[in-house]
Interface confidence: low
């Protein structure tokens, strides 16, 4: 009762239901590529103010499989992860222990998702589970946004990924994983 294995023109092998395709090999060793250099901190001295053009809100492309419990998408989706520093930022020394701890002062600008796109994915499930389709909300672009105290903090929660969520007023999907779990998977996978 599984999906039939097939081969298309791109010589992609889709396995029988219950087996999962491995992540594409080029994604295995791109950890450094997908991270802000130097742990995201610019290599400069405290008290130095850099021009805003030297900081950018970067859009890093990640490819991942969407999961819903034991089910996994037939094909991976590509989405953006917002990364980088939004300037200008004045870096101040940390008073505690007089260590050099950098933090931005002034208005709080964050590199956060700006636009989202919906994409349909088909999920293949092992063990006789019926295949499923889901709409997932993926980050389409990033933007430096000035945060106010009224700013919805939930916007900051899921920098990396927007997991498929139940519609408003709907029961939680029995096997839907939390955004946090998907985020953890994303971070661990790459």
């Amino acid at each position: 009762q599984g999906w039939q294995a097939f081969k298309n023109d791109a010589t992609e092998i889709i396995p029988e239901l219950g087996e999962y395709p491995e992540p594409p090999p080029e994604l295995e060793n791109n950890k450094t590529m997908n991270r802000a250099e130097n742990g995201g901190r610019p290599p400069h001295h405290p008290f130095e103010t850099k021009d805003v053009s030297e900081y950018s809100c970067r859009e890093l492309h990640f490819t991942r499989y969407v999961t819903d419990g034991p089910c996994r998408s037939a094909k991976p989706v590509t989405e953006l992860v917002c990364s980088g520093q939004c300037g200008p930022a004045r870096l101040l020394p940390n008073a505690i222990g007089r260590g050099k701890w950098w933090r931005p002062s002034g208005p709080d600008f964050r590199c956060i998702p700006d636009r989202y796109r919906a994409q349909r994915v088909q999920l293949l499930c092992p063990g006789g589970e019926a295949p499923r389709a889901r709409k997932v909300r993926l980050v389409a672009s990033c933007k430096c946004k000035r945060l106010t105290r009224f700013h919805n903090q939930s916007e900051l929660k899921d920098f990396g990924t927007e997991a498929a969520r139940p519609q408003k007023g709907r029961k939680p999907r029995p096997r839907a994983r939390s955004a946090k779990a998907n985020q953890a998977e994303l971070e661990n996978a790459y």
């Epitope: 097939f6 298309n8 889709i14 088909q122 006789g128 589970e129 019926a130 295949p131 499923r132 889901r134």
Partner: antibody, heavy 118, light 107 residues
Framework: QVQLVQSGAEVKKPGSSVKVSCKAS????????LNWVRQAPGQGLEWMGT????????TYSQKFKGRVTITADKSTSTAYMELSSLRSEDTAVYYC???????????WGQGTTVTVSS | DIQMTQSPSSLSASVGDRVTITCSAS??????LNWYQQKPGKAPKLLIY???SLHSGVPSRFSGSGSGTDFTLTISSLQPEDFATYYC?????????FGGGTKVEIK
């Protein structure tokens, strides 16, 4: 708007095969599962199998496995259901139905009557 | 296979009546249950999906509830166009299976 248009009625001899088509329009054909369901006269609905046209993945009801083949032609947005080794109890109306994301069949073809008679 | 049992198999009711149809699954299907309406000579029409979500264009007099193994379709005030056969369908496990149907007739 979404439409599923099926081929016309068929009369077949026992032991032969029938191939029913279902032409989809009004949506992206490769984005949705396309199911086949049949209904014998005066009986209930019986699921036969499904295809996901994006990669031609199929899954069938065990009852029909080996006798049913579901295919899809992406270039014409048409799905096909072929049933072989026909017997009189295969006389039924055969429906194609698009499947939405919670497993619901939200759009159905008008049905194709297949009569198996010697 | 998961067996879906509908009851009653038929019922007679009058316009304005409140009608309840039940559907029982032979094993737990969480909320993966849909309801369809079918009129003679026509294809089924989706009414309710995922146990309780109303399909677009379906009147609000239709509602669904339940979880696990027991589910209910309720028509709060039966209208002339509601006389038809109703089917439940599970989408938890393969193969997808339908209930035997409940025919709602005019009293």
């Amino acid at each position: 708007q979404v439409q599923l248009v099926q081929s016309g009625a068929e009369v077949k001899k026992p032991g032969s095969s029938v191939k029913v088509s279902c032409k989809a329009s009004g949506y992206t054909f490769t984005d949705y599962f396309l199911n086949w369901v049949r209904q014998a006269p005066g009986q209930g609905l019986e699921w036969m199998g499904t295809i996901y046209p994006y990669h031609d993945g199929t899954t069938y009801s065990q009852k029909f496995k080996g006798r049913v083949t579901i295919t899809a032609d992406k270039s014409t947005s048409t799905a096909y259901m072929e049933l072989s080794s026909l017997r009189s109890e295969d006389t039924a109306v055969y429906y194609c139905a698009r499947e939405e994301e919670d497993g619901q069949f939200d759009y159905w073809g008008q049905g194709t009557t297949v009569t198996v008679s010697s | 296979d998961i067996q879906m049992t509908q009851s009653p198999s038929s019922l007679s009711a009058s316009v304005g009546d409140r009608v309840t149809i039940t559907c029982s699954a032979s094993q737990g299907i969480q909320w993966y249950l849909n309801w369809y309406q079918q009129k003679p000579g026509k294809a089924p029409k989706l009414l309710i999906y995922y146990t309780s979500s109303l399909h677009s264009g379906v009147p609000s007099r239709f509602s669904g509830s339940g979880s696990g193994t027991d589910f209910t379709l309720t028509i709060s005030s039966l209208q002339p166009e509601d006389f038809a056969t109703y089917y439940c369908q599970q989408h938890s496990k393969l193969p997808r299976t339908f209930g035997g149907g409940t025919k709602v007739e005019i009293k």
